[in-house]
């Protein structure tokens, strides 16, 4: 029986050109984590494997840094980075746990505009 739960950073927004940390936390299970995958929709971004360490997909090497911890840092954000991100924890004996994060990348002017006209 799978007892674990994944807590994620949820829905987040960031400014174009900036960076953001994606984080997931698996708790409430004694299952052994063997690998953590980070995916963007259907694309693999990175893997952290118990025996092999980190692997960053070649197409993201310049813009993705591992960590902190089992998280992932996305840099030099573009509007095209907007979308769903998934952390996939492979565990034994439980199986797979998946967490979802939605990232919205805002145009700098939009972010500034929103901040300037916030209702107190």
């Amino acid at each position: 029986m799978m007892t674990g739960t994944i807590e994620t950073t949820g829905n987040i927004s960031a400014e174009k050109g900036g960076s953001i940390i994606l984080q997931c936390h698996l708790s409430s299970t004694t299952a052994q984590v063997t690998q953590v995958n980070w995916e963007q929709q259907d694309q693999l971004l990175a893997i952290c494997n118990a025996d092999l360490g980190w692997h960053i997909s070649p197409s993201f090497k310049d813009r993705v840094a591992p960590g902190p911890g089992l998280g992932l840092t996305l840099q030099s954000l573009t509007v095209n980075d907007t979308g769903e991100y998934f952390c996939i924890y492979h565990t034994y004996p439980d199986g797979t746990y998946t967490g979802r994060i939605f990232l919205e990348v805002l145009e700098s002017s939009v972010a500034e505009h929103g901040a300037r006209f916030q209702i107190p």
């Epitope: 698996l26 708790s27 004694t30 118990a50 360490g53 980190w54 840094a65 902190p68 911890g69």
Partner: antibody, heavy 117, light 107 residues
């Protein structure tokens, strides 16, 4: 098997600089963060900073930013920590440690740095 | 920076006893908390990762629990080799930080 090899000791003069080394073997050097940790007189542990050899990305504790520079030589699988303008406060044991899926899973034996005239 | 507070600073116990060591985080670090043992003139050794993940080669008498701000390392039926310093460490955000340590000594 995974090993992190550090020199046992270094003796340097106040005001000088030193470059401590940590030679990794038994794993793919570029796939793991390497961290450096300071311990004075058998007291607590202080995180200095880290470097990801796959990209050269570094992070430092603010306290050590002006004191420390972390580098790697991927061809020899060696991590380096350069400490500048040494004082007696820098006398300590310095450990390198690898961060994997299970956090700091392997540690070097530590280098005892003595700053004395 | 995240602050980790360990208590007690020193714990005097008898072999065979069971003990619980505490590590309190401020602010919340979810489950990004790790436990290390260090004996005199040795390197630290990883005991538990991510609050409760067991580590290969570590005796089963060591276990970890907690999430958020309160964490516990439990050692069942202490053996003489278990005496030494114990540190917690967080990897939720940079800069990583360590707790001040708990010294486990023989009564």
């Amino acid at each position: 098997q995974v090993q992190l090899q550090q020199p046992g000791s270094e003796l340097v003069r106040p005001g000088a600089s030193v470059k401590l080394s940590c030679k990794a073997s038994g794993y793919t050097f570029t796939s793991y963060w390497m961290h450096w940790v300071k311990q004075r007189h058998g007291q607590g542990l202080e995180w200095i900073g880290n470097i990801y050899p796959g990209s050269g990305t570094t992070n430092y504790d603010e306290k050590f930013k002006s004191k420390v520079t972390l580098t790697v030589d991927t061809s020899s699988s060696t991590a380096y920590m350069h400490l500048s303008s040494l004082t007696s406060e820098d006398s300590a044991v310095y450990f390198c440690t690898r961060e994997g899926l299970y956090a700091f899973d392997y540690w070097g034996q530590g280098t005892t740095l003595t700053v004395s005239s | 920076d995240i602050v980790l507070t360990q208590s007690p600073a020193t714990l005097s116990v008898t072999p065979g006893d069971s003990v619980s060591l505490s590590c309190r985080a401020s602010p919340n670090i979810r489950n990004s908390l790790h436990w290390f043992q260090q004996k005199s003139h040795e390197s630290p050794r990883l005991l538990i990762s991510y609050a409760s993940q067991s580590i290969s080669g570590i005796p089963s008498r060591f276990s970890g629990s907690g999430s958020g701000t309160d964490f516990t390392l439990s050692i069942n039926s202490l053996e003489t080799e278990d005496f030494g310093m114990y540190f917690c460490q967080q990897s939720n955000s940079w800069p990583y930080t360590f707790g001040g340590g708990t010294k486990l000594e023989i009564k």
